[in-house]
Every structure is written in C-alpha cells, then in structure tokens.
Interface confidence: medium
C-alpha cells in the first residue's frame, strides 16, 4: 500500500529572465527512492538516479541545473516556460509518486510564490 505523500512548492510564479527552484519532497513512507524524473508536459527535463547520477535533457542543459537535493533549478526563464511540471518519484517497493507544480512566468515584477500543497 502506498502511504507516502509528496509535498511540492505548489503554484509558483517568477519573473521573465529570472530563475526558480522546483522542489518536491516525499514523506510518510520508508520506501527507497530509486529515481526522480522531472517532466514538463511532453518533455523530460531531467533524471536523478541512484546509479546513473543526474542526467539533464539536452534541450534544457543550458538553463537547467540539478539540485538543490532532488530538486531542479530553471534559469533564464521565458514566458514559454509557463505550465505544469511534474516530479515523478520511482520508489521501491511502493511504486510511483507524482507531484505537480504550476509555474507562471510573468513579464513584470509582480511574481509571488504560492502556498505549498500536498498530493497523496
């Protein structure tokens, strides 16, 4: 039975040209995390695997940095970066946990961070 929950940074906003940290945290389970995938709609951004290490998708390598921890840092943001991001935790023996973050990239300086929320 999957008992864990994923806490994410929730709905967040950032300024065009700036950077943002996408962060998820898996709690309430003793399952071992074997891999974390970071995905954006129809693209893989990055993989962090215990054996492979970090792997950043080539189309993002110039503006995506691994970390902190299992998180991901997006740099040089554009309005096209607005959208859903998913952290997918592959665990043993529980299976897969997925967290969702919605990022809005704003033209002006009115960017504010949203509240954290949990996905069971």
């Amino acid at each position: 039975m999957m008992t864990g929950t994923i806490e994410t940074t929730g709905n967040i906003s950032a300024e065009k040209g700036g950077s943002i940290i996408l962060q998820c945290h898996l709690s309430s389970t003793t399952a071992q995390v074997t891999q974390v995938n970071w995905e954006q709609q129809d693209q893989l951004l990055a993989i962090c695997n215990a054996d492979l290490g970090w792997h950043i998708s080539p189309s993002f390598k110039d503006r995506v940095a691994p970390g902190p921890g299992l998180g991901l840092t997006l740099q040089s943001l554009t309005v096209n970066d607005t959208g859903e991001y998913f952290c997918i935790y592959h665990t043993y023996p529980d299976g897969t946990y997925t967290g969702r973050i919605f990022l809005e990239v704003l033209e002006s300086s009115v960017a504010e961070h949203g509240a954290r929320f949990q996905i069971p």
Epitope: L52, H90, T98
Partner: antibody
Framework: QVQLQQSGTELVRPGTSVKVSCKAS????????IEWVKQRPGQGLEWIGV????????IYNEKFKGKVTLTADKSSSTAYMQLSSLTSDDSAVYFC?????????????WGQGTLVTVSA | DIVMTQSPSSLSVSAGEKVTMSCKSS????????????LAWYQQKPGQPPKLLIY???TRESGVPDRFTGSGSGTDFTLTIGSVQAEDLAVYYC?????????FGSGTKLEIK
C-alpha cells in the same frame, strides 16, 4: 547526422569474454543515455541496461548483472558492452541505441547491431 | 518486472486491409499524476534494427505515416495500421518504459498475403 557505429561480428569460445563497441557521432556524446538491447536469432528484444556517458553510471537488468559490464569513453565518444563467461545462450545480435528526447526508454537512433556467436 | 504480452503472435493480411494488434502489461503503465502512459511501439523489418513508431501509447514519432495509430491506457494497448502497405511487413513490438527493466513484448509478426 546522428550515427551509432557498432563493431563487427564476433566468433568467440565458451567461457571467454567479448567487448562490443558503439561509436557515436553527429551529436554530443555525453548529452544522451545509451541503452543496450539483446536479440537472439529469430527471437524478441531484451533490455540489457543503460549507461550515462557523462557520469559513467549504469543501470542493469537484473537478468544481466554479472554477465554484462557497460562502460563509456568520453574521449572517443564510444560506449562499450563487455560480456563475460560466455555460453551459447549469449549468442545473439546486440544493439546499442540512443534515447529519445522525451523518455529514456525510447530509441529512435540505433546501431546496426553486432552478431556475437559463441561456439567451441 | 513488468510482463508485456502481445497477441496475436502473427497475422497475415492483404495490402489495403486494416490491422489491429494487442499489447497487455502485467502492471499499469499509466502515471495517474500526469495522465501519461509509458508505452512505446516499434517496427522491426528483417535484417534491420527496430524503429520507433509510437510513444506515450498514442503519439506518432516524427516521420511515421499516419496509417499507424496507437491507443489504449493502463494495461491494454492497441496498434492499428489503417491500410496495410507491402512495406509494413515486419515484427511489431510494444515496450514498457514506465519502470526498469524496460521490458518488450514478444512481438507480432505481420505478413502480407
């Protein structure tokens, strides 16, 4: 254009080892994962494992642990698969493949295959 | 490991006919969090390496003719060839890329009458 050039046919004795090479060209070698797939004559496809040429880290199908060692040489943009303690069950065509932009299990670029025949 | 079961193992059709083949997985390949199915279809012609046709259960790879259609979700998937051409003679494999090891089905061999 992207190419994966594999080494030629190998005829080897039981109990020995063989090292199959996969030379990549047309792209930045460390930007993509390399997967290896086995196909016995007239049979289906078996996923052997994957290597991250950037870190040297690898993931293996449990079935091939102890049998296969995956390595990569960044200086020559070449991935290697070593098979040890060869038996007739290891006689097969071995393919290397570069992963697709979206998922690390998707292979649109393949080597031509290397036939390994184990015979006394 | 996730077991992929394909049926039929072979089929023989005339050019112009519609063909469907099935792939079933022993575990769901659907990630309910992002609503994606981690299933791919490959075509392997004699003497050649496999070629990626479909990923995400239903998205055609660039350059793949639109007569190839993937459908299904969870554990049941289908590859349909709308109007078979002579060049479609091949073995078709489905593949799990939801979790390691990335297992393949045993294949469906398509023969042209």
């Amino acid at each position: 254009q992207v190419q994966l050039q594999q080494s030629g046919t190998e005829l080897v004795r039981p109990g020995t080892s063989v090292k199959v090479s996969c030379k990549a060209s047309g792209y930045a070698f460390t930007d993509y994962l390399i997967e290896w797939v086995k196909q016995r004559p007239g049979q289906g496809l078996e996923w052997i494992g994957v290597i991250n040429p950037g870190s040297g880290g690898a993931i293996y199908n449990e079935k091939f642990k102890g049998k296969v060692t995956l390595t990569a040489d960044k200086s020559s943009s070449t991935a290697y698969m070593q098979l040890s303690s060869l038996t007739s069950d290891d006689s097969a065509v071995y393919f290397c493949a570069r992963y697709h932009y979206y998922g690390s299990g998707l292979f649109p670029y393949w080597g031509q295959g290397t036939l390994v025949t184990v015979s006394a | 490991d996730i077991v992929m079961t394909q049926s039929p193992s072979s089929l023989s059709v005339s050019a112009g006919e519609k063909v469907t083949m099935s792939c079933k997985s022993s575990q769901s390949l659907l990630n309910s969090g992002n609503q994606k199915n981690y299933l791919a279809w490959y075509q392997q012609k004699p003497g050649q390496p496999p070629k990626l046709l479909i990923y995400g259960a239903s998205t055609r790879e660039s350059g793949v003719p639109d007569r190839f259609t993937g459908s299904g979700s969870g554990t049941d998937f289908t590859l349909t060839i709308g109007s078979v051409q002579a060049e479609d003679l091949a073995v078709y494999y489905c593949q799990n890329y939801h979790s390691y090891p990335f297992t393949f089905g045993s294949g469906t061999k398509l023969e042209i009458k």
